[in-house]
């Protein structure tokens, strides 16, 4: 087993919004859980974007989910991750 | 580390309003988390009634909503529950809690106070 | 809202027996699953977050299971300290729900 390394990303969207993207890559095998919450509970699903689950050239995998917030609710927001039995949460950097 | 300290009166009288305080010390209340109030019944169930967040935002359990205020006093660090047209249904032990945003379970708990709701 | 079932609702057993308490979930609650213990007289404490995870301090002779709808608590070896009430806690969605709770009593 391989954990995957888990990047929290923000970018400009639309006025007063910002899009954050949690990446997760270099994991093996490649079933893996990667989510945002909001408030502590789960956030919608048609809310969220997901990436395929991609091989990234090292025998390893790769994906992302990403969201749009408005800014200054950012604290609000966490990426959850889960990859054979080990969990781990991840804010939105300031 | 964080602590939580319940207040208020222990009798209500059927129709009138509960209200009860939750000072928190070792954190500041605007700094972060979901400050929550729940409840628990005479025959032990538990209920989540609500949180105020560390901006002032609220979410309340739907069973309640038209009966439940939850504030704050930034400068004491305290929050507070209102609660109003009681009934003896309400007879409970009220505790406040937080929650971090990576997920919403109740990590620390006051050490509660029991309100009756009676003539 | 997700209603959360417990069972047993009681439990009478010796310190050294291993016990299990399950939860049922009326969604799937996707590992979105708290345990806490309490004592007569105290406030709950948490025991288990993310429905696996030991909260600090817990002993190890806690483990938690399940996914989806079904999901256990496990308690080897009993020691005299573990008894009171055991509740599940969903937070996969608002309104957050408790299960009615399981005592653990000494036989």
């Known amino acids: 087993t391989v954990p995957p390394m888990v990047n929290v990303t923000r970018s400009e969207a639309s006025e007063g919004n910002i899009t954050v993207t949690c990446r997760a890559s270099s994991f093996y095998p490649r079933n893996i859980a990667l989510t945002w919450r909001q408030d502590g509970v789960s956030l919608s699903h048609d809310t969220q974007q997901w990436g395929d689950v991609l091989p990234d050239g090292n025998g390893t995998y790769q994906t992302w989910v990403a969201t749009r917030i408005c800014r200054g609710e950012e604290q609000r927001f966490t990426c959850y991750m889960e990859h054979s039995g080990n969990h781990s949460t991840h804010p939105v950097p300031s | 580390d964080v602590q939580l300290q319940e207040s208020g009166p222990g009798l209500v009288k059927p129709s009138q309003s509960l209200s009860l305080t939750c000072t928190v010390t070792g954190y500041s209340i605007t700094s972060d988390y979901a400050w929550n109030w729940i409840r628990q019944f005479p025959r032990n169930k538990l209920e989540w009634m609500g949180y105020?967040?560390?901006?002032?935002?609220?979410n309340y359990n739907p069973s309640l909503k038209s009966r439940i205020s939850i504030t704050r006093d930034t400068s004491k660090n305290q929050f507070f529950l209102q609660l109003i047209s009681v009934t003896t249904e309400d007879t409970a032990t009220y505790y406040c809690?937080?929650?971090?945003?990576?997920?919403?379970?109740?990590?620390?708990w006051g050490q509660g106070t029991l309100v009756t709701v009676s003539a | 809202d997700i209603q959360m079932t417990q069972s047993p609702a009681s439990l009478s057993a010796s310190v050294g027996e291993t016990v299990t308490i399950t939860c049922r979930a009326s969604?799937?609650?996707?590992?979105?699953l708290a345990w806490y213990q309490q004592k007569q007289g105290k406030s709950p404490q948490l025991l288990v977050y993310n429905a696996i995870m030991l909260a600090d301090g817990v002993p190890s002779r806690f483990s938690a299971s399940g996914s989806g709808t079904q999901y256990s608590l496990k308690i080897n070896s009993l020691q005299p300290e573990d008894f009171g009430s055991y509740y599940c806690?969903?937070?996969?969605?608002?309104?957050?729900?408790f299960g009615a709770g399981t005592k653990v009593e000494i036989k």
């Open positions: 806690q969903h937070f996969w969605s608002f309104p957050l729900t």
């Open positions: 105020i967040n560390y901006s002032g935002t609220t």
């Open positions: 809690s937080y929650y971090r945003y990576d997920g919403a379970w109740f990590p620390y």
């Open positions: 969604g799937n609650i996707h590992n979105y």
